[in-house]
Structure formats: structure tokens, C-alpha cells
Amino acid sequence: EVEKTACPSGKKAPEIDESLIFYKKWELEACVDAALLATQMDRVNAIPFTYEQLDVLKHKLDELYPQGYPESVIQHLGYLFLKMSPEDIRKWNVTSLETLKALLEVNKGHEMSPQVATLIDRFVKGRGQLDKDTLDTLTAFYPGYLCSLSPEELSSVPPSSIWAVRPQDLDTCDPRQLDVLYPKARLAFQNMNGSEYFVKIQSFLGGAPTEDLKALSQQNVSMDLATFMKLRTDAVLPLTVAEVQKLLGPHVEGLKAEERHRPVRDWILRQRQDDLDTLGLGLQGGIPNGYLVLDLSMQEALS
């Protein structure tokens, strides 16, 4: 056993190359210099080491860097990254987006592992916020990233980062998440002109309040029915027939096909049948003529 700990004569590795795949685990431990390994980490990925051999290489790096690996090593970990534990990763200080991309590439196409989740957490905390470039990178690898975050986590996304969000990144977000993202998008896109603004804000409108929908109705935006159906019911209900007509423009005809579905159904119930008739779509279920409409919520607020 004692002899095995010493490197056999002529076996000392002058560099990291393919010949090392024939080394037994104890030979790798004894014959590969940890500092050499650290400087030539980029070569490891090209060599078909077994999992057991990778364990040895990781052990050597752990001994060399007990406080955590430097970024120069982390960037070239490649498949060795899969051997890291969240505890290992918590010791790292990753600041380069290139390093993050290199490690995400290793896990590409697979569900996010605890290691990747820890890496992202460390990276974002190190940057202080989820900035535009980071968000761009994360959504490229993980299209559902934003919609997997809690509203609390989303609240820390700065408005400037919203420019990195593509419509498909929001496809599976729920209303509570959009409630958080919408005000940020509104702020981010506030200096754009009417039609350009609408194109950008459209995917976020599931979080829009009534007053913003009223404002949009004055801008000839021609909202499509798919977007309208994703609006908050409580935001749609106070809109008048005229406002909905202006908001939807030529798409207003689509209301007929959706008259039994929320939010259209609930909105119809709040409108006077006379007003609905002016659309000429045959929408039924409005408040009959001559009925008095009491706004109970207003009454409660006053009492």
C-alpha cells in the first residue's frame, strides 16, 4: 500500500493528455501535479476520463484550493462541473458571464440541477442584481426561467433587465408573476412611442391595471383577442363598451366567440345590454334596460 502512494518511475505526468486515461486512480493521485492540472484544465474535457478518474482530479483540485477554486479554473471545468456539489460551488466567486455560459453549456438541455441553481444564485448575488446580460443568458438556456421564479425573486429584477425578456419567456407565467413584471416593463418602455410601446408591453399586459388599459384604448393599438383573454378580470370589468371597442379595434368581432369565457363573460354581465347591442355582435347577458346598477364596492368604501 505504501508503494502505491509514490509515483512509479517514469510515470510523472509532464502535461495533461490522453495517456492519462490508462492511469489507475492511485496513479493519477500520485503522478499528476495539482498545479499542472489547474493550469491545463481546458484539456480535461477533451480526454475521455472515467467518472472515477474525474473524482480523483476533483480531489486534487480540492486539495489545491480548499477555500474554493479560482475563476480561471472554474471557467474550464467542463464536465468536471457535474462532479461539484452545491457546497463546493458556494465557495466560488464567479463574476464573468463567460464562465457562467461555459458551465451552463455543460448542463444544456437538462433540467436545472441543484448545482446550476446554486451557481446562478452565487452569480446573481455577486452582481448585486439580475442584470440584462445575465437574464439574456439564463433565458437562452432556460426558457421558463422567469416563470419559475417567485414574485419575491422577480421583484428584484431591475426594469433595465426587462429589455432582455422575449414574449416566449413569459408564456407560462401566472397572473401573480405578471403583476410584478408589468410595472417594471411599463417603466422600462416608457420612452417609446405608441405603436412600438404596445409591441413591447403586450406580453406583460396580464399584469396591467384598468387605468393602463383605458389609456391604451385611446392609442389605436388593436389588441388581439389572445392578449385580451389573458388580461386580469378585475382590470377588464370596469372598461366601458366603447373602451373595449377602441382597445380591440377590428378584433372586437372576436368577442362573440369568447362570450362564455372569462374575462369576456364577466365583463358582459357588467355592461348594459343597450351598450352591448351597439357592437352589433349579438352579445347577450348584459344588464337589461331600465335596471339600476349599484356599485356595491363603492358603497362599502364610502360607509
Epitope: 437538462h110 433540467e111 441553481a117 421558463g144 419559475s148 419575491e152 401566472d174
Partner: nanobody, 116 residues
Framework: EVQVVESGGGLVQPGGSLRLSCGVS????????MRWYRQTPGNQREWVAS????????GYADSVKGRFIISRDSAKNMMSLQMNSLKSEDTAVYYC?????????WGQGTQVTVSS
């Protein structure tokens, strides 16, 4: 392969309670948000409630707020929806939805019927 399975649906009288469960098997490893949606015939799916990956914070549709409670057991990859004070308009097929950073997974649904 990730599988999502709902259970617990059934027939209940107005004002009654029911508890739905959702089990997830497969390699859902980190950062997943779990949601309940429901769908009535001819209608689009409607969001009911969510429980988020970090800290277990929750969100509810206005129509169920104060009546339904969503909870999860991350260790067992389970989620449940406690439905109280049920109304006839809660009748629907209830679907469990698991959102990961990479994908969205749906169950086959469980029927809830509220009727006297």
C-alpha cells in the same frame, strides 16, 4: 421522464370541502413552481393558485381567495389544494402544472363536481 399525477377529485355538495393532490415523479431537481389550473367544458384553462420555488410563497385567483389553500412538500415532490366552501362554479377538471426553468409539465387532470 417527468410524470405529473393528480388525485382527490370527486362529487361534493355546495359548501363542502375536497383536497386535491399532485405527485411529481422524475428528475425535477431545482427551482420549480407548482400551480393548479382548472377547465370547464368549452372554456380555456383558468389559473387557480401557485406555490413558488423559494420560500413557499403562494398566489391565488380572486375567485378562490380565502377558500382554497395551496401547499407543498418539496421533499416528497407533492403539492395539494385544500378546497373549502365549494360552489357550483368550482365544477371543473383541475390540472396540476409544474414549471421548471426548462419545461412545463401537466397532469391529466382530476374532475371536481360541486352539485346538490
Amino acid at each position: 421522464e417527468v410524470q405529473v399525477v393528480e388525485s382527490g377529485g370527486g362529487l361534493v355538495q355546495p359548501g363542502g370541502s375536497l383536497r386535491l393532490s399532485c405527485g411529481v415523479s422524475g428528475s425535477i431537481l431545482a427551482l420549480n413552481t407548482m400551480r393548479w389550473y382548472r377547465q370547464t367544458p368549452g372554456n380555456q384553462r383558468e389559473w387557480v393558485a401557485s406555490i413558488y420555488s423559494s420560500g413557499g410563497s403562494t398566489g391565488y385567483a380572486d375567485s378562490v381567495k380565502g377558500r382554497f389553500i395551496i401547499s407543498r412538500d418539496s421533499a416528497k415532490n407533492m403539492m395539494s389544494l385544500q378546497m373549502n366552501s365549494l360552489k357550483s362554479e368550482d365544477t371543473a377538471v383541475y390540472y396540476c402544472n409544474v414549471q421548471t426553468p426548462l419545461n412545463v409539465y401537466w397532469g391529466q387532470g382530476t374532475q371536481v363536481t360541486v352539485s346538490s
